[in-house]
Amino acid sequence: TLNSVLNSNAIKNLPPPLGGAAGHPGSAVSAAPGILYPGGNKYQTIDNYQPYPCAEDEECGTDEYCASPTRGGDAGVQICLACRKRRKRCMRHAMCCPGNYCKNGICVSSDQNHFRGEIEETITESFGNDHSTLDGYSRRTTLSSKMYHTKGQEGSVCLRSSDCASGLCCARHFWSKICKPVLKEGQVCTKHRRKGSHGLEIFQRCYCGEGLSCRIQKDHHQASNSSRLHTCQRH
């Protein structure tokens, strides 16, 4: 089973209003069942939202970054913090909310074409002296913005779903985010029982495709709550 996720190695499905309604395209991803932060409450609500410990920005949600909760606080104690909106102060790109990046210490809109080249190092994995490429990772010293007009194919590294081609979403896979296929009819999905639930996992699934919703598979109605299988079904 995948209940072996330990020590803040997984992304969260953020509760509304931070991440859209769970299981809806607004949230981009659907948590794999049973993959939870140890000791966490599978059905937490936003009211008792627990700080999520982290070591790297990549371990936080797309609308979060990893930092000490207090200015000048203990660097050893870091949690996922809400991203900074436009015109807020920042120290790195990950601090700024999707659609923005950090320029001269301020979060600014990333509409400009030159933005992507500036954050190349944050989304590609350096190979040192190894010039091979593997699954969308590549070593580059420069990165033309043109690359980002071409949407990522399945397996390409991404920051968010808008980086991916049609029919794909940006989802966590181990400790990277890559473009994965939006779920089709009959495919296994994850339905959170409450909008505020936190599924913490490193194998995220996309949401169900258009015209589909994540529902209990008919022949699983009699099964126990924990083993209920959800699949993408026609509305």
């Epitope: 995948l2 371990e59 994995e125 350096s126 040192g128 400790w175 890559i178």
Partner: antibody, heavy 119, light 106 residues
Framework: EVQLLESGGGLVQPGGSLRLSCAAS????????MSWVRQAPGKGLEWVSA????????YYADSVKGRFTISRDNSKNTLYLQMNSLRAEDTAVYYC????????????WGQGTLVTVSS | DIQMTQSPSSLSASVGDRVTITCRAS??????LHWYQQKPGKAPKLLIY???TLHSGVPSRFSGSGSGTDFTLTISSLQPEDFATYYC????????FGGGTKVEIK
Amino acid sequence: EVQLLESGGGLVQPGGSLRLSCAASGFTFRTSAMSWVRQAPGKGLEWVSAISSGGGGTYYADSVKGRFTISRDNSKNTLYLQMNSLRAEDTAVYYCARGPRGRGAFDVWGQGTLVTVSS
Amino acid sequence: DIQMTQSPSSLSASVGDRVTITCRASQSISTYLHWYQQKPGKAPKLLIYAASTLHSGVPSRFSGSGSGTDFTLTISSLQPEDFATYYCQQSYNSITFGGGTKVEIK
């Protein structure tokens, strides 16, 4: 040259402990997720554990959960596997591997170090 | 966990033969499937990742195909250095390897 070099294997009694090390060179270790994969004598490959690039995320196979601990020291370009409460079935060659990368492949492997658990 | 079943478990072939090894997943794994070659006493080597992409430095006689549950590794013309054991590995959900296919000299 991209290289991984394991060390620390040997003979240990059941219930004993051992710490494996993997020295990395030729690539940017601090940006790479790393794993341990083992192979029992005459058997197939079994993935054991993985750790994220910064060390904040760790992940284990059910067979070793609670007994093994993966860690890394990016300043030393070294990966570790602390193995406690060893059992006879843990006897294997332990490989250090770079990955999972991208969709989850392991693209660089060490030569392996043999761990024998026997009384 | 997702089970990976390789077939055959072993095969005998001659230099120049076309060799096909199959790998079947217990559930759909999209293209999160990778192939490795291992020679006795040596570490595995990545041949193909993401079902069909040839890893750098791997000869073009190796190819991979498939998606979902059924995958194939093909060696178009077997060379003396290709006699080895081949493993598939899925990473769609956790990480599991197939049991291996030993390619021996006929």
